[in-house]
Interface confidence: low
Amino acid sequence: GELETSDVVTVVLGQDAKLPCFYRGDSGEQVGQVAWARVDAGEGAQELALLHSKYGLHVSPAYEGRVEQPPPPRNPLDGSVLLRNAVQADEGEYECRVSTFPAGSFQARLRLRVLVPPLPSLNPGPALEEGQGLTLAASCTAEGSPAPSVTWDTEVKGTTSSRSFKHSRSAAVTSEFHLVPSRSMNGQPLTCVVSHPGLLQDQRITHILHVSFLAEASVRGLEDQNLWHIGREGAMLKCLSEGQPPPSYNWTRLDGPLPSGVRVDGDTLGFPPLTTEHSGIYVCHVSNEFSSRDSQVTVDVLDPQEDSGKQVDLVSAS
């Protein structure tokens, strides 16, 4: 006869490990007892359990409550045992010794491998601002046994670098994603993907990128200069910009206070029926936590009685 077992039994942390040991004998042969021991190199054998055909299962004190026989029905030639709730410390070499009648004793070894699935964490880098050089966007760390694989899934262009720290029974892998921040990256997902043989599927953690920026400011409303004449109603100037965080707007007049009746409504400056008093230089000031921009325009209200052309200047400054 001969023993059937596995070279390696792989189990995920916390699961039950079946340690197989089956005697395939000739007709009429019987198994008297099966002794299980842990036999790691450099250490003496440590008994796990003794499985006796007549007296049943006896578990050594060190493994009390953790070693059981597989559920019925049981084959009398099957000396397999279950090791409950596998922990990392269980990883190692195990031996089953089978005493048979009349063929004698047989022994076989297997290696128990305990997979420790990682619990990944993602840490965003410093605040991203347009104009920075290559900057850390996020780092992702996962520790497990064996070492997990950490990669990135994103449409954003960047560079990655990884490092690994080995511990006695596991390894921690950290991957960093560096990029050159630009406004087009705003709202883009950056996903850390962790693969490991102890995971049924890859673990994914997504970080949404936020890049601070402020676009140049410009003023709309003066495109048709002939509309800016005395008596016109509904005249308005609109300040155009965009930014992250969203900017706030402030209107001032460079050559004095805003005329009475002029309404400020966020990015829009609304005028009452135009008079020559509304002529002047108006400044839109756009700001967010990242930066500020100014754009100024010169309004020259035409008097239809006069046949003089109107000048309109647009100046943008940051």
């Epitope: 880098g125 920075q132 050089g133 850390l136 490092r163």
Partner: antibody, heavy 120, light 107 residues
Amino acid sequence: EVQLVESGGGLVQPGGSLRLSCAASGDIFDTYMSWVRQAPGKGLEWVSRIYTDGSSDYADSVKGRFTISRDNSKNTLYLQMNSLRAEDTAVYYCARQTEDRSYGYDLDYWGQGTLVTVSS
Amino acid sequence: DIQMTQSPSSLSASVGDRVTITCRASQGISSYLAWYQQKPGKAPKLLIYAASSLQSGVPSRFSGSGSGTDFTLTISSLQPEDFATYYCQQHYTTPPTFGQGTKVEIK
């Protein structure tokens, strides 16, 4: 063990050019490489870095005047310095980013440095 | 750019003394900090990476600690060969920046 040897330093007039070389024994081209300089009696200042794909970063003080490059076949790193100024006077070191852990950009191997003097 | 400020700028100590050098970043840099030693006429030498990890071949009397903005390099028992200038460097974001240096002299 990696060894880095810089050359190409010397005396140059303001506005002039120099090309520094950094020859490596041992393979450096699966790593990032940097130039760091040190003005006489002063501290260390990072100048430029080149990545494995050939892309690069520069300090604001040298942007537009200096160009970093690498020749993988010769295992050599270069720094082309144009429009040199008196304040560029320094010992220039080439240095390798730590290879085995890729932890950010600390520098584990440095050359002995080459002196660049910009003076009329 | 992130500013790195070392203190003190110089110190005098005797062989066997415990020496502490601090480095402060103008913004949080996690553990992205390295310490270097430089002797006159020589290139800098990496002592500590990742704020607290000892570079291979560096004596265990050197240690680093800290995270965020405040970091410390400690020499537990100063030896004759430790008299040099020490620099911290952040590599959290580009450009990497160095502290101004701390010169350790013989008392």
